[in-house]
Amino acid sequence: QPSVSPGEPSPPSIHPGKSDLIVRVGDEIRLLCTDPGFVKWTFEILDEMNENKQNEWITEKAEATNTGKYTCTNKHGLSNSIYVFVRDPAKLFLVDRSLYGKEDNDTLVRCPLTDPEVTNYSLKGCQGKPLPKDLRFIPDPKAGIMIKSVKRAYHRLCLHCSVDQEGKSVLSEKFILKVRPAFKAVPVVSVSKASYLLREGEEFTVTCTIKDVSSSVYSTWKRENSQTKLQEKYNSWHHGDFNYERQATLTISSARVNDSGVFMCYANNTFGSANVTTTLEVVD
């Protein structure tokens, strides 16, 4: 428990006075917060919170979902915490199966344990398939398992959190990893035709094709030396993972001489930008 020099505000005191507590499912959780300026208890698991304004937190029949961090806070904003594991052989993991990873970043598989004394807490592939050889992870019983430096190749990888309990492997529900690619090159842009010669009244239509790893790529048609918003229509396709194509079609239904000029298809992503132009000449 915390000790502070007299006169300074001190953090609350929690009974039982330990950082971690293990209780069996069905047993009572009884936590006492002692502080003259007690404000509240906060319970947190899977980043969700509940509050209790009584200084004694009592759960008569503990369930696995009562596993988590219990924090007592006083009026000075000082706090103290205890982590409670509710051991339930039928529910070894608490899970949130939403799993997204940004390429080259770490991502957390949220499967905290309800029993810290199980062994070999790790990740396993679904249907007995091995995990990718280069997949590295760090387990944390209170948070889950952190996958280090997500690769594009892990997209739609199916995995389970796994522990050994009494000599047997126990798996969590399935997680499907969805990887968001990092932009590592500028978009590829091309135009259906580099120049057009039209008579007044004819329709001008030109298509720009933008290719990139995801639909997050930005694109627009611009008229050079003009701020006027051009009317464009889009079609887009995913040709498998990380192969996105967009067609942006610019149309002027009845071209006029003063529509003549250079039109630019511009695209950018977080890596950089690219553009391509087409020239329209309208004669009367």
Partner: antibody
Framework: QVQLQQPGAELVKPGASVKMSCKAS????????MHWVKQTPGQGLEWIGV????????SYNQKFKGKATLTADKSSSTAYMQINSLTSEDSAVYYC??????????WGQGTLVTVSA | NIVLTQSPASLAVSLGLRATISCRAS??????????MHWYQQKPGQPPKLLIY???NLESGVPARFSGSGSRTDFTLTIDPVEADDAATYYC?????????FGGGTKLEIK
């Protein structure tokens, strides 16, 4: 105890833009993805896009790309959606929804946007 | 884009009987046996409320009268028995693939 608070209504003029808020409480804001959904009587429910937890990356429905912009302020646990160049077709109820365990487990009450001169 | 087609568009069911709503996807919403299909209930002036997630899992606090089934492209929401409070519009939604999409809705009326 998870709550998503949205303003009830916004009245805006055609051509203007509107920035609506979604204030989150009861969970760690930076740990969950926030989605936005548009509802009109004619088009039903349409997914606009998502702002991902942690780094603020976004992904949009192509239909709303350039029309909507999603941002978040971690310090106030608030997600925002800005809609620009408003027309009558943008009149709708806009919801924020938190993704939890693969589904939209919590929704705001919605903001009714009316575009009128 | 994955298109979700709900049928029927509207449905009138007598109190105490069974209501069945169908949702068909234009392509599979399954990955490794997980169906990324969810069902929501919406009443006028309220946001959608989650009923069923991952095709067949009952959301906490939702009565067991609601059940979901199906896989790949064909999914069903069943309410049995129907109660007066179930009058609402029901939507299916997939989040297997961007952009996430919703069905057009089924309006349930209680006779």
């Amino acid at each position: 105890q998870v709550q998503l608070q949205q303003p009830g209504a916004e009245l805006v003029k055609p051509g203007a833009s509107v920035k609506m808020s979604c204030k989150a409480s009861g969970y760690t804001f930076t740990s969950y993805n926030m989605h936005w959904v548009k509802q009109t009587p004619g088009q039903g429910l349409e997914w606009i896009g998502v702002i991902y937890s942690g780094n603020g990356d976004t992904s949009y429905n192509q239909k709303f790309k350039g029309k909507a912009t999603l941002t978040a302020d971690k310090s106030s646990s608030t997600a925002y959606m800005q809609i620009n160049s408003l027309t009558s077709e943008d009149s709708a109820v806009y919801y924020c929804a938190r993704e939890r365990d693969t589904r939209f487990g919590n929704w705001g009450q919605g903001t009714l946007v009316t575009v009128s001169a | 884009n994955i298109v979700l087609t709900q049928s029927p568009a509207s449905l009138a069911v007598s109190l105490g009987l069974r209501a069945t709503i169908s949702c068909r996807a234009s392509e599979s919403v399954d990955i490794y046996g997980n169906s990324f299909m969810h069902w929501y209930q919406q009443k006028p002036g309220q946001p959608p409320k989650l009923l069923i997630y991952l095709a067949s899992n009952l959301e906490s606090g939702v009565p067991a009268r609601f059940s979901g089934s199906g896989s790949r492209t064909d999914f069903t929401l069943t309410i049995d028995p129907v109660e007066a409070d179930d009058a609402a519009t029901y939507y299916c939604q997939q989040n297997n693939e961007d952009p996430y999409t919703f069905g057009g809705g089924t309006k349930l009326e209680i006779k």
